[in-house]
């Protein structure tokens, strides 16, 4: 059986070493042990007896099926303790008694169907982080099992297989920064939301099948949600389950930000937010985020029509991986508020985007990512953008773009512009010169020749560039990274040349250590603070005697250097 | 209507390793929470992993975590189980099966497949 390694802090590391028992010789010298992925199986009453001092104790994955109810009394400075993935089919309150300073408590992922026959956690005054619950078993939350816990930063239930809710098991909680709830279905959902509703400011629902859920008004008085953002992950929604969904919203007038994440949407968008208050009621939700969102019948989907009166105050929308090939002209002008739209990921061509963004779309839109879809012309993108008035910041990375022409139009505030990723060999007068910021990394260019008189940021890694571009274009240039390319070497006179350079990464180029290169960064100890990756990432890569040298380790020959 | 056919299942080592697949026919498999459980003789169903829809969420009972991964393929209508430092405990029939619901639940299940028998010696 292997021993534990300790470093001087008193960090134990125990993980994976086949113990079956907490190992023997265990002190108050210790702040932290991890015995996560052993076969333990049973914690004794003195086991743990030494670890006075004890803050962390990480037990996850350790078969643990029986823990002697005293078994953590000495652990009165315990802050983290992980119980997760065990095989422990019932809790005791005993074991949390003595633990008056923890602050974070996983049990889940072991096998009980309840929290305990009496309330788990009175004593724990201190928590901030509870997560509890399975995917098979854990049936039943009860008023009892958050008794004496008052205020959580985070709560993560895993209750998927829950077949009752005693109503108000969790309005004892009066303060919840992050609630995460797993709930394979929505029958209890409506019962959970009026117990939440005073206390929860973030409401996280994960893996739900909401296709059947009906709402109906909530037993509550007039009360004042703190609730800023909802998210859903992995749900499944129809468009009735929609509708009915939205009505929950008016009882979150605070409500500032709503996220789709993995979702499956069994419907066509055909969505009827009958309720006139409804649409009122969404007027603070700022941000609204769909990501990988899966519509079956994705090519019959509606025009969205029904929702445009919705969406009129959002400011930042985002809708990535989700097979979104249009947003028709009328719902762009509908989107009046938008300041920040990004469909990355998706199926946009030049052609569909030029009704998307037509005359009055997105009025206020200031940030447009595009990032990976399916465009090819570089200059019928800027041409087509033209309409978007306040437009300062464009990312078209990801694009396969054909070669960019000699002159091309875009959008006249733009200041912002990221190409990184789109197989461009050369840089050409296309790109606009009232450019304050340029991102052309991860590209063919092997040579930069484009004079940008308001540049301050370029960013040209991981390309094929040999030196460092001239100075005399970027009069204004505050930061240029430019790892990963070819470059073999830089001088004073070069870094000199840029009069305002603030921050340059050009770490992990193939730098030839020359008697000039390495008598400028002796003689330069000021490198380390224009040179934000230095030493570590500035490695010669010739002559073969120095190969793989740090440039600030590296001495010059003697002989070579002085003749 | 979706049938499910196991396949993979056979004898092993202590130590070793296997990959169960479960090929689904039928339409909208992409629809569908897809399941592992598995049953010695005489014992109830035991959950053993779950998968929703996308393949975003995974989870498992704690007596498998860290040694079996589940995994779908949409494209091919199969889900995986990859089992690996199999224990004679792990001797069971694997069962597949289909729902609607994200759940280590048994009763939640709507389709199941017949079975495919691991025997794990030591």
């Known amino acids: 059986q292997e021993s534990l390694s300790c470093d001087a802090s008193g960090v134990c590391d125990g993980r994976s070493r086949s113990f079956t028992s907490i190992p023997s010789g265990l002190t108050a010298a210790m702040k932290s042990l991890d015995l996560s992925f052993n076969k333990i199986t049973y914690i004794g009453h003195g086991d743990l007896r030494a670890c006075a001092n004890l803050q962390v104790l990480i037990l996850k994955s350790s078969r643990i099926n029986t823990i002697e109810g005293d078994a953590f009394y000495s652990l009165g400075s315990l802050e983290h303790l992980d119980l997760s993935d065990n095989h422990l089919s019932s809790l005791s309150s005993s074991w949390f008694g003595p633990l008056s300073s923890l602050k974070y408590l996983n049990l889940m992922g072991n096998p009980y169907q309840t929290l305990g026959v009496t309330s788990l956690f009175p004593n724990l005054t201190n928590l901030q982080t509870l997560r509890i619950g399975n995917v098979e078993t854990f049936s039943e939350i009860r008023r009892i099992d958050f008794a004496g816990l008052t205020s959580l930063n985070e709560l993560e239930i895993k209750a998927l297989s829950l077949r009752n809710y005693q109503s108000q098991s969790l309005k004892s909680i009066r303060d919840i920064h992050h609630l995460t709830l797993h709930l394979s279905e929505s029958a209890f959902l409506l019962e959970i939301f009026a117990d939440i509703l005073s206390s929860v400011r973030y409401l996280e629902l994960r893996d739900t099948n909401l296709a059947r859920f009906q709402f109906s008004p909530l037993p509550v008085d007039e009360v004042s949600s703190p609730m800023k953002k909802l998210a859903f992950r992995g749900s499944v929604l129809t468009d009735e389950s929609f509708n009915e969904l939205l009505k929950l919203l008016r009882y979150i007038l605070e409500l500032s930000e709503v996220e789709f994440d993995d979702c499956t949407l069994n419907g066509l968008g055909d969505f009827n937010p009958s309720e006139s208050d409804v649409v009122s009621e969404l007027g603070k939700v700022e941000t609204v985020t769909i990501r990988r969102l899966h519509i079956p019948q994705f090519y019959l989907f509606y025009d969205l029509s029904t929702v445009y009166s919705l969406l009129e105050k959002v400011k930042r929308i985002t809708v990535e991986n989700s097979k979104v090939f249009l947003v028709p002209c009328s719902f762009s002008q509908h989107l009046k508020s938008l300041e920040f739209l990004d469909l990355s990921e998706n199926l946009m061509v030049e052609e569909y985007l030029k009704n998307s963004a037509c005359k009055g779309a997105w009025p206020s839109l200031q940030t447009l990512v595009l990032s990976q879809n399916h465009l090819r012309s570089m200059q019928k993108t800027g041409e087509i953008l033209l309409t978007l008035k306040n437009l300062t910041s464009l990312d078209i990375s990801r694009n396969t773009f054909h070669p960019m022409p000699d002159s091309c139009q875009w959008p006249e505030k733009m200041r912002f512009l990221n190409l990184s990723s789109t197989g461009i060999r050369v840089v050409k007068t296309c790109i606009p010169q009232t450019l304050e910021v340029l991102d052309v990394s991860n590209n063919n260019l092997d040579s930069f020749s484009l004079f940008l008189p308001r540049l301050q940021e370029l960013y040209i890694s991981r390309n094929k560039l040999k030196t460092l571009p001239d100075a005399s274009l970027f009069p204004v240039l505050l930061v240029m990274k430019i790892r990963e390319n070819a470059v073999s070497t830089f001088s004073k006179d070069q870094l000199g040349s840029f009069p305002k350079l603030e921050t340059l990464e050009a770490g992990d180029n193939h730098f030839v250590c020359s008697c000039e290169l390495l008598s400028f960064t002796m003689e330069t100890p000021a490198l380390a603070q224009i040179l934000v990756d230095w030493p570590d990432s500035y490695l010669c890569d010739s002559p073969p005697r120095l190969h793989g040298h740090r440039l600030q380790d590296a001495r010059p020959s003697v002989l070579e250097c002085h003749q | 209507e979706v049938q499910l056919v196991e396949s993979g299942g056979g004898l092993v080592q202590a130590g070793g390793s296997l990959r169960l697949s479960c090929a689904a026919s039928?339409?909208?498999?992409?629809?569908?929470?897809m399941g592992w459980f598995r049953q010695t003789p005489g014992k109830e169903r035991e959950f053993v992993s779950v998968?929703?829809?996308?393949?975003?969420?995974?989870d498992y009972s704690s007596s498998v975590k860290g040694r079996f991964t589940i995994s779908r393929d949409n494209a091919k209508n199969t889900v995986y189980l990859q089992m690996t430092s199999l224990e004679p405990e792990d001797t069971a029939v694997y069962y597949c099966?289909?729902?609607?619901?994200?759940?280590?639940?048994?009763?939640?299940?709507?389709?199941w497949g017949q079975g495919t028998p691991v025997t794990v010696s030591s």
């Open positions: 099966a289909a729902g609607q619901y994200y759940t280590g639940r048994s009763d939640r299940y709507d389709y």
């Open positions: 039928g339409r909208a498999f992409s629809s569908y929470v």
């Open positions: 998968i929703n829809w996308s393949g975003g969420s995974t």
